[in-house]
Interface confidence: low
């Protein structure tokens, strides 16, 4: 018995294509690239029908439906633009991912262009089906310093010029240390900020001496020391990591990392600092910021900063030799011979940064660590040298500039 003539579906074909079909003849219905066979609301690659004894086909010819990649995945810190009218998500449609500029940029300068493939998956020429990554931009504050300051005997910082600075605060709102934002969820600070004062009779650091993540919080976007303002972001602490070679007695490797419970939103007042690309040149000018004590032992109302030069390592070692204090290779010194400009109590862990004039970007040089009193003549401020421990920082945080 002969079965009726078959019409292939729109955007599809039937094989074999014959003038006539008889009992037991089978045909395979398939669709053009970018289309799927749709039968009874079920999508499939092909569909087979057979000519029956009574001269009818075993099933109706299915339709061919264009492949739909559906709504593209959301990109953290990114946006999606549809290149096709009506925001189409079907075969050959195109979308473009971009990062929330100017605070995030796309890793490897990827085009961000994805096309809906015949398989129903958004595909990028380089990344395949993986989404691009938006990385935080570091060291490029929206507000630049109008004047360079010449925390101890320093000047009030201009709001927004130090967007990487973090305040470590007790739950009662009392600040106790500074820090710097790295990447989107890490704070680098001084290890000595994260433990209680040790018993001089038995100066051994025990786990019980460490601050628990629930003992303190991080405040970013802060300008005033105690007054709250609109740009602050208060963040919980997930985890703290002290440098494995930190020595609380000598302050060697006085650096620690605080992982945030959640990422801050980057904006004009909150932005990470860049990690150093190489060693710091002696004599280079650096800026140190903090809310620590000022002249006459008073705390300032706002963030303060000083501009001071990096001091030759051997000069610094000689300055501290009479006090039997070691200035080791993981430390870097800054200040002026005549004194007067220095970090002080409460500045610990805060940033010492320098400007790369070619790139216009700020880099972290050190974190406030120790010194003999504050701003004393012939005594320099000693800072934990970030370049020395950069590998450890990158290993723990995964942060790259």
């Amino acid at each position: 018995n002969e079965c009726p003539e078959l019409q292939p579906p729109v955007h599809g074909k039937i094989e074999p294509s014959q003038a006539k079909y008889f009992f037991k003849d089978q045909v395979l219905v398939s669709c053009d690239t970018g289309y799927k066979v749709l039968k009874d609301n079920v999508e499939m690659d092909t569909f087979q029908i057979e000519c029956l004894k009574d001269g009818t086909w075993s099933n109706k010819i299915p339709t061919c439906k264009i492949v739909d990649c559906r709504a593209p995945g959301e990109l953290e810190h990114g946006l999606i633009t549809f290149s096709t009218r009506n925001n189409l998500t079907t075969y050959k449609s195109e979308i473009k991912y971009s990062c929330q500029e100017p605070y995030y940029k796309m890793l490897n300068n990827n085009t961000g262009i994805y096309t809906c493939s015949a398989q129903g998956v958004w595909m990028n020429k380089v990344l395949g089906r993986s989404l691009p990554t938006c990385l935080p931009v570091c060291g490029l504050p929206k507000f630049s310093r109008k004047l360079m300051a010449r925390i101890f005997n320093g000047r009030p910082a201009q709001k927004g010029t130090t967007p990487w600075i973090a305040m470590l605060s007790h739950l009662n709102g009392q600040p106790f240390c500074g820090g710097s934002l790295l990447g989107s969820s890490w704070i680098v600070t001084a290890a000595h900020c994260l433990h209680q004062s040790l018993d001089p009779e038995d100066p051994t650091l025990r786990d019980s001496d460490l601050l628990s993540p629930s003992d303190f919080k991080i405040i970013l976007g802060k300008h005033w020391r105690l007054r709250s303002d609109e740009n602050e972001q208060h963040l919980g602490v997930k985890h703290t990591t002290l440098h494995p070679q930190y020595d609380p007695n000598t302050f060697e490797n006085d650096v620690a990392l605080v992982e945030l419970l959640e990422s801050p939103v980057l904006n004009a007042f909150v932005m990470p600092i860049c990690l150093p690309e190489g060693p710091q040149q002696e004599g280079a000018m650096v800026i140190v910021s903090g809310w620590g004590k000022q002249f006459l032992q008073r705390f300032p109302e706002t963030l303060m900063e000083i501009e001071i030069p990096i001091v030759d390592h051997s000069t610094c070692q000689k300055a501290y030799a009479p006090l039997k204090k070691k200035v080791t290779r993981d430390m870097i010194c800054a200040g002026e011979k005549e004194g007067g400009k220095d970090a002080c109590a409460g500045d610990s862990g805060g940033p010492m940064v320098t400007l790369n004039r070619e790139r216009g970007q700020w880099y972290l040089v050190g974190t406030v660590s120790w010194g003999d009193d504050c701003g004393k003549k012939d005594r320099y401020g000693v800072y934990s040298y970030i370049h020395h421990n950069k590998d450890w920082i990158q290993r723990v945080t995964g942060v790259r500039n």
Partner: antibody
Framework: SVEESGGRLVTPGTPLTLTCTVS????????MGWVRQAPGEGLEYIGI?????DIYYATWAKGRFTISKTSTTVDLKITSPTTEDTATYFC????????????????WGLGTLVTVSS | AVVLTQTASPVSAAVGGTVTINCQAS??????LAWYQQKPGQRPKLLIY???NLASGVPSRFSGSGSGTEYTLTISDLESADAATYYC??????????????FGGGTKVEIK
């Protein structure tokens, strides 16, 4: 905007899930909280889900409620409702982006009414 | 858990007058306090955060003050539209939010 849905009359012990649908902003940037108000009574804080998905419940609400979220919705499941759970349930967005610290609420939905009765 | 005790309801005042509502915390809350206004059948509206910061769009007739355990909301130049119930909220973060986020019982303001 923020809009709650799913409120209805349920019998005691029948689990009920309320949904908060957001538009105009991303849940990956904001913390979202649930607050309820029994008829003629004051506001009562239930819990908050952070932009990263960390969930914090009021002590009294632990075990009684479950908060979860998708990319555009935040759900509040009342695990085993009692008549005392009869209230209008509000979903609200926290003021500070990326900060569970400042869990005061500056964008509220209109609320959805749940009545628990046998 | 922190307990917030508000001025007893109702508080009555005339149009053009001033109303003061107090909120007392059972322990120091470090100015982590917000004030809300709620009219019958409506959603709450944020007025003040950080004890004294005015939320955007809120008239300057509303002001907040206080520290430690004692906080105050003041409404001056009262208008009939100010008739509502006012709540204080102590807010906290992270693990401390379990018992930290709590509302006062509310204070109803009536305009004569």
């Amino acid at each position: 905007s923020v809009e709650e849905s799913g409120g209805r009359l349920v019998t005691p012990g029948t689990p009920l899930t309320l949904t908060c649908t957001v538009s105009g902003f991303s849940l990956s940037n904001y913390n979202m909280g649930w607050v309820r108000q029994a008829p003629g009574e004051g506001l009562e804080y239930i819990g908050i889900i952070s932009s990263q998905g960390d969930i914090y419940y009021a002590t009294w609400a632990k075990g009684r409620f479950t908060i979860s979220k998708t990319s555009t919705t935040v759900d509040l499941k009342i695990t085993s409702p009692t008549t005392e759970d009869t209230a209008t349930y509000f979903c609200a967005r926290a003021r500070h982006v990326g900060s569970a610290a400042d869990s005061y609420f500056h964008l509220w939905g209109l609320g959805t009414l749940v009545t628990v009765s046998s | 858990a922190v307990v917030l005790t508000q001025t007893a309801s109702p508080v009555s005042a005339a149009v053009g007058g001033t109303v003061t509502i107090n909120c007392q915390a059972s322990e120091e809350i470090y100015r982590n306090l917000a004030w809300y206004q709620q009219k019958p059948g409506q959603r709450p509206k944020l007025l003040i955060y950080g004890a004294s910061n005015l939320a955007s769009g809120v008239p300057s007739r509303f002001s907040g003050s206080g520290s430690g355990t004692e906080y105050t909301l003041t409404i001056s130049d009262l208008e009939s539209a100010d008739a509502a119930t006012y709540y204080c909220q102590r807010y906290a973060w992270g693990k401390n939010s379990a018992d930290g986020n709590t509302f006062g019982g509310g204070t109803k303001v009536e305009i004569k």
